[in-house]
Amino acid sequence: LQEKIEEIAAKYKHLVVKKCCYDGVRINHDETCEQRAARISVGPRCVKAFTECCVVASQLRANNSHKDLQLGR
């Protein structure tokens, strides 16, 4: 997960945009990525980075938990 997120974040050269991506990675079981992104007011650039990283992180976590279930962990 960390490697993949770092790969995505590396393309964002504006520090705030990069941090928007990292914010998206934080675990939040109560809201979807879309719901969380809707509260961002600093600009669409941040929304896009947040959403991309949030979705990728969610997918990777889902895949990992699915693998764990298959392995009977």
Partner: antibody, heavy 118, light 111 residues
Framework: QVQLVQSGAEVKKPGSSVKVSCKAS????????IHWMRQAPGQGLEWMGY????????NYNENFKGRVTITADKSTSTAYMELSSLRSEDTAVYYC???????????WGQGTTVTVSS | DIVLTQSPASLAVSPGQRATITCKAS??????????MNWYQQKPGQPPKLLIY???NLDSGVPARFSGSGSGTDFTLTINPVEAEDTANYYC?????????FGGGTKVEIK
């Protein structure tokens, strides 16, 4: 309407520090980044750094080698730029500006003249 | 850091003529199809004023005689036709990456 109002002119001695304020009004202060630029007499614009008041995130121009500190007071919607170890080359007009959509500077302060002289 | 090179450093134009200023970036300021290049006008004793954002978008209240074009590394600000009140310094600025950088400026004088 959106306004950025800066503090008044300063005259400082070499080696001292200066702290310039930038009071924002007419919009939600925490929604936009505040940048600081400076302009030496007859010269172009030099970017110094910024702060995102909502999170307190900052980034600085490495040319200032740790001499610059940018802070923000959300309770008063005011951003501050402090420059230390002043030298004569720091004599300039200092500007704050709001960055809209993380793309461009749409509103600027009126500028603060800082003169460094012994 | 992205270095922005403006040319010419100064130019004198007659009223009604066209003024063209170029800004060349040391690396692309395009990100996923969006060009983070802006243009500002600065008159003596005043702060800079936004003219053009995202390479070609005119800011509200800016006269239509100002236009911007370009992508990647090469950008142009055009004033056509030039008016007497356009005497000022003009700066390009990129916001694609930190540190944000400005061009060295172009001084436009009206003959």
């Amino acid at each position: 309407q959106v306004q950025l109002v800066q503090s008044g002119a300063e005259v400082k001695k070499p080696g001292s520090s200066v702290k310039v304020s930038c009071k924002a009004s007419g919009y939600t202060f925490t929604d936009h980044i505040i940048h600081w630029m400076r302009q030496a007499p007859g010269q172009g614009l030099e970017w110094m750094g910024y702060i995102y008041p909502r999170e307190g995130w900052t980034n600085y121009n490495e040319n200032f080698k740790g001499r610059v500190t940018i802070t923000a007071d959300k309770s008063t919607s005011t951003a501050y730029m402090e420059l230390s170890s002043l030298r004569s080359e720091d004599t300039a007009v200092y500007y704050c500006a709001r960055e809209r959509n993380l793309e461009y500077f749409d509103y600027w302060g009126q500028g603060t003249t800082v003169t460094v002289s012994s | 850091d992205i270095v922005l090179t403006q040319s010419p450093a100064s130019l004198a134009v007659s009223p009604g003529q066209r003024a063209t200023i170029t800004c060349k970036a040391s690396q692309s300021v395009d990100f996923e199809g969006f060009n983070y290049m802006n243009w500002y006008q600065q008159k003596p004793g005043q702060p800079p004023k936004l003219l053009i954002y995202a390479a070609s978008n005119l800011d509200s209240g800016v006269p239509a005689r100002f236009s911007g074009s370009g992508s990647g590394t090469d950008f142009t600000l055009t004033i056509n036709p030039v008016e007497a009140e356009d005497t000022a310094n003009y700066y390009c600025q990129q916001s694609n990456e930190d540190p944000h950088t400005f061009g060295g400026g172009t001084k436009v004088e009206i003959k």
